[in-house]
Interface confidence: medium
C-alpha cells in the first residue's frame, strides 16, 4: 500500500508509469500501484527516491539526452536536483532539461530538451504535478543534532533507511540520522511520531493536563520550530493564564537560551496573536519589548530572564516549546444565533441570545460608560468570536472612523486582560503593533477602532463612544452548580472543600469564621493542591488571601491552625525572612507565592473541611 | 502502577477490636490522603476514616471515638484501629489512596482489594 508521501509517476500520453527495474534502468510499464519499483517520494526540497532502492533518480551530467538513473542519494549533487516547471514538466534544477520518456528505441527515461507530452508527467490517479506531494521536513527531537531534520535514506550499520526506526534501540524509540551516513557522522533524533514511550518526551501539568515539550538543544527558526510541533498534533506555546506562566516558568528554570513560543505579529493587517488561536490576554512581555524594530515579528521566551517574552527576527535558530491537549481556556459555548429566541428592547440589536447598543454620540471616559450600560441593565460588550465581532461592525452601525470602549482591560491584574461582564477571555483581534501596553503609558482599557474594528489598548480617562451588551429577555435562569459532597458555594478538589472567605478580616478573625462554618483556614499539604489554590484565587483582584499558616504560638516555627504537619512551603522570594507573623498567598503575577504579613492585616481568605461522605466513583468490579 | 494491599480483617464478636493494616506500594512517587472505606451487603459503599500526608483526620459520624486511623508516611501505609465493634460494622472494609507515580502526573485513586470483618456472636 501507498504511504501518502509515495507516488507512481505517470505520463497520460503513454498511459504506463515509471517503473525503477535496476538500479542502473529506470523504464516505463503498465501502472501497478502494488509494484514497490514504481513508488517513488520526495526526500528533500529537490531529490526523488526510489522506495524499492533507497536511491535517488539523478543524472551523469547536465546534458542533452542521458539516461536518468538511480544513485546513491547525495542532497549535495547537482545532479540529483529536480524542479516542477510549469504546467507537469519535471526539469533538472537551474537547466531546460526534463524528465522525458525515452523513444521506441531508448526504452529508459532520458533527460531531454523537449517540452512535449512525452515530459510531461503526474502523480498516477490525480491531475497533479509530482510536487503536489512535496517533502515534508521531519524535525528531529533530542539526540545530538540541534533538531537538525531526519536525512532520508540514511545509512546505519551499512543498512539504508527511508524511514524512522528502532534499529539498535532496545526501548523501541523511533529515531532517523541527520545526515545520509550515520555510520561516519553519528548525528540522530528522536522522530516526532508517535511510538512506545513518546510521552515521556512531554510534560503533563496535573491542573489543566496541558503538555508541554521544551525541546531546548535545537536551534530552529520560528516557522521550523512551528512546523516540529504540528508534526506532533501540537503547536507552539501559547499562554493565557498566569498559572500557565508559573508553570513555565518553573519548567524551564534550569535552562538559559532563549525559546520560540507561538505569540508572533505575522498577520499584515493585525497585532500579536499565539499560532494556535488562543486570545492574547495576558502579557509578559521583558522590559523594551516588545520593540517596533520591522522584522521582529516572532516571540521567544527567555528562561534566564524570568521566562519573559521577547520578540525577535524569526529567522534567528533557538530552541522552542510545544503544547497539547485540552486548551487552558475554560470551556464557554457562545449559542449560535438560530439557538436563541433574541427579544431585545427598543434601539437594541439582538445577536445569538444578546442585546447591542452603540453609545456613539454621548463620549464618556470608560468607567462611566460602564456604569451607564450596567444602569441599562447589561454591561460593556464583551466580544467571544469572529462572527460576534463581525456582527457588531457589520449590523450594528459601526463606521470606520469610530473609537469605541469595549468590555476588555486589565484594570484588575495588570497585563492580564479580562471582560467586565466576567465571561471568559475566548478571542482576541488586535490591531498592528497592539496591545502596546507600556508601563509608563497606563493603557488599562481597550477599544475598537479602525474599519476592520480591532482593538487597541488605550488609557480609561479618555471620553469615547461605547458599546454595550446585556442578556436578551428570553433568557432561562442560571444555575449554581452544588458538588457533591460540599455545600453550596463550596469547590471540591480531591478529599476537600473550599471557599473563598469575602470579608476582609484579620487572621484570628478569617480563623473563627472558616470555625464557624465547620471549617478551617486552609492548609497546603503539596504542590498539586497548591496548583488548585492558586487556580482558586491567583487571579482574583485582591492581593492577599490568609491560609492557615503561622508563627503565633512559637516564633519562628510555622504551624497550620489545625493538628496537621507542614510538609510543603510555597515562599515568596525573602520569605519567611525573620519576621514573625500569619502566611497569605499572593494573587496576580506571583500568584500562589506565600508572603508573610502582620496578622492584624485585613485580608481575604479560604477555609477548607473535609468533604462528606463518598468521595470517589464506585470501585470497579473485577 | 501503585498497589494496595490490606490485611487484619476477620470475625470478632461485639464489643471486640480489630487493627486494619494497608501497605501502599508499587511505582509511587508521593501519597496524598489514605482512607478507609465500607461496604455493607445491599449498601452503598461508604467513607469511614481518611487521613491526609500532614496527619489531618476525618471520621464518619458513626464511628467517631470508636475507631482511630494512623499513619506511617515513611512505610506508605494507613492503619484502623477498630474497637467497641458492633454488628452494623460488620462489611468489607477497602483501603483507599489519592497517590502520583511521577512528578508531572496529576493524583489517581487506587484502591486495595478489601477485607471481610463481620462482628457476630
Known amino acids: 500500500l501507498l504511504d501518502t508521501r509515495q507516488f507512481l509517476i505517470y505520463n497520460e500520453d503513454h498511459k504506463r508509469c515509471v517503473d525503477a527495474v535496476s538500479p542502473s534502468a529506470v523504464q516505463t510499464a503498465a501502472c501497478n500501484q502494488d509494484a514497490e519499483s514504481q513508488k517513488f517520494r520526495w526526500v528533500s526540497e529537490s531529490q526523488i527516491m526510489s522506495v524499492a532502492f533507497k536511491l535517488c533518480l539523478g543524472v551523469p551530467s547536465k546534458t542533452d539526452w542521458v539516461a536518468i538513473t538511480l544513485y546513491a542519494c547525495d542532497s549535495k549533487s547537482e545532479f540529483q536536483k529536480w524542479e516542477c516547471k510549469n504546467d507537469t514538466l519535471l526539469g533538472i534544477k537551474g537547466e531546460d532539461l526534463f524528465f522525458n520518456y525515452g523513444n521506441r528505441q531508448e526504452k529508459n527515461i532520458m533527460l531531454y530538451k523537449g517540452s512535449g507530452l512525452w515530459s510531461r508527467w503526474k502523480i498516477y490517479g490525480t491531475t497533479d504535478n509530482l510536487c503536489s506531494r512535496g517533502y515534508e521536513a521531519m524535525y528531529t527531537l533530542l539526540g545530538n543534532a540541534n533538531g537538525a531534520t531526519c536525512a532520508f535514506p540514511f545509512k546505519f550499520e551499512n543498512k539504508w533507511y527511508a524511514d524512522c526506526t528502532s534499529a539498535g534501540r532496545s526501548d523501541g524509540w523511533l529515531w532517523c540520522g541527520t545526515t545520509t551516513d550515520y555510520d561516519t557522522d553519528k548525528l540522530f533524533g528522536y522522530c516526532p511520531l508517535k511510538f512506545e514511550g513518546s510521552e515521556s518526551l512531554w510534560n503533563k501539568d496535573p491542573l489543566t493536563s496541558v503538555s508541554y515539550q521544551i525541546n531546548s538543544k535545537s536551534a530552529l527558526t520560528w516557522h521550523q520550530a512551528r512546523k516540529s510541533c504540528q508534526q506532533q498534533n501540537a503547536e507552539l506555546l501559547s499562554i493565557t493564564e498566569i498559572h500557565e506562566q508559573t508553570y513555565l516558568t518553573g519548567l524551564t528554570s534550569s535552562l538559559t537560551s532563549g525559546l520560540w513560543i507561538g505569540l508572533n505579529s505575522l498577520s499584515f493587517n493585525s497585532g500579536w496573536q499565539w499560532s494556535d488561536r488562543s486570545p492574547f490576554r495576558y502579557l509578559n512581555w521583558l522590559p523594551g519589548s516588545p520593540s517596533a524594530e520591522p522584522g521582529k515579528s516572532c516571540v521567544s521566551l527567555n528562561p534566564g530572564k524570568n521566562a519573559k517574552w521577547e520578540n525577535l527576527e524569526c529567522v534567528q535558530k533557538l530552541g522552542y516549546i510545544c503544547k497539547k491537549g485540552n486548551t487552558t481556556l475554560n470551556s464557554f459555548v457562545i449559542p449560535s444565533e438560530s439557538d436563541v429566541p433574541t427579544h431585545c428592547p427598543s434601539q437594541w440589536w439582538p445577536y445569538a441570545g444578546h442585546c447591542y447598543k452603540i453609545h456613539r454620540d454621548e463620549k464618556k471616559i470608560q468607567r462611566d460608560a460602564l456604569t451607564t450600560c450596567r444602569k441599562e441593565g447589561g454591561d460593556l460588550t464583551s466580544i467571544h468570536t469572529i462572527e460576534e465581532l463581525d456582527f457588531i461592525i457589520s449590523q450594528l452601525g459601526y463606521e470606520p472612523n469610530d473609537e469605541l470602549w469595549i468590555g476588555l482591560n486589565d484594570i484588575k491584574i495588570q497585563m492580564y486582560f479580562e471582560w467586565s461582564d466576567g465571561t471568559p477571555v475566548t478571542f482576541t483581534k488586535w490591531l498592528r503593533g497592539e496591545p502596546s501596553h507600556e508601563n509608563n503609558r497606563q493603557e488599562d482599557c481597550v477599544v475598537m477602532k479602525g474599519k476592520d474594528g480591532y482593538w487597541a489598548d488605550r488609557g480609561c480617562e479618555w471620553p469615547l463612544g461605547y458599546i454595550c451588551k446585556m442578556k436578551s429577555r428570553s433568557q432561562g435562569p442560571e444555575i449554581v452548580e452544588v458538588e457533591k459532597g460540599c455545600r453550596k458555594g463550596w469547590k471540591k478538589h480531591h478529599f476537600y472543600c473550599y471557599m473563598i472567605g469575602h470579608t476582609l478580616s484579620t487572621f484570628a478573625e478569617a480563623n473563627q469564621t472558616c470555625n464557624n462554618e465547620n471549617a478551617y483556614l486552609t492548609t497546603i499539604e503539596d504542590r498539586y493542591e497548591q496548583a488548585f489554590l492558586t487556580s482558586f484565587v491567583g487571579l482574583r483582584p485582591e492581593k492577599y488571601f490568609w491560609t492557615g499558616l503561622s508563627d503565633i504560638q512559637t516564633k519562628g516555627t510555622f504551624q497550620w491552625t489545625i493538628e496537621e504537619e507542614v510538609r510543603f512551603t510555597h515562599w515568596n522570594s525573602d520569605m519567611p525572612g525573620r519576621k514573625p507573623g500569619c502566611v497569605a498567598m499572593r494573587t496576580g503575577i506571583a500568584g500562589g507565592l506565600w508572603d508573610v504579613l502582620k496578622c492584624d492585616e485585613k485580608a481575604k481568605f479560604v477555609c477548607k473541611h473535609w468533604a462528606e461522605g463518598v468521595t470517589h466513583p464506585p470501585k470497579p468490579t473485577t | 502502577q501503585v498497589q494496595l494491599q490490606e490485611s487484619g480483617g476477620g470475625l470478632v464478636q461485639p464489643g471486640g477490636s480489630l487493627k486494619l493494616s494497608c501497605a501502599a506500594s508499587g511505582s509511587i512517587f508521593s501519597i496524598k490522603t489514605m482512607g478507609w472505606y465500607r461496604q455493607a451487603p445491599g449498601k452503598q459503599r461508604e467513607l469511614v476514616a481518611a487521613v491526609s500526608s500532614g496527619g489531618s483526620t476525618n471520621y464518619a459520624d458513626s464511628v467517631k471515638g470508636r475507631f482511630t486511623i494512623s499513619r506511617d508516611n515513611a512505610k506508605n501505609a494507613v492503619y484502623l484501629q477498630m474497637n467497641s465493634l458492633k454488628p452494623e460494622d460488620t462489611a468489607v472494609y477497602y483501603c483507599?489512596?489519592?497517590?502520583?507515580?511521577?512528578?508531572?502526573?496529576?493524583?489517581?485513586?487506587?484502591w486495595g482489594q478489601g477485607t471481610q470483618v463481620t462482628v457476630s456472636s
Open positions: 483507599n489512596a489519592d497517590g502520583v507515580v511521577a512528578w508531572d502526573q496529576p493524583y489517581d485513586n487506587y
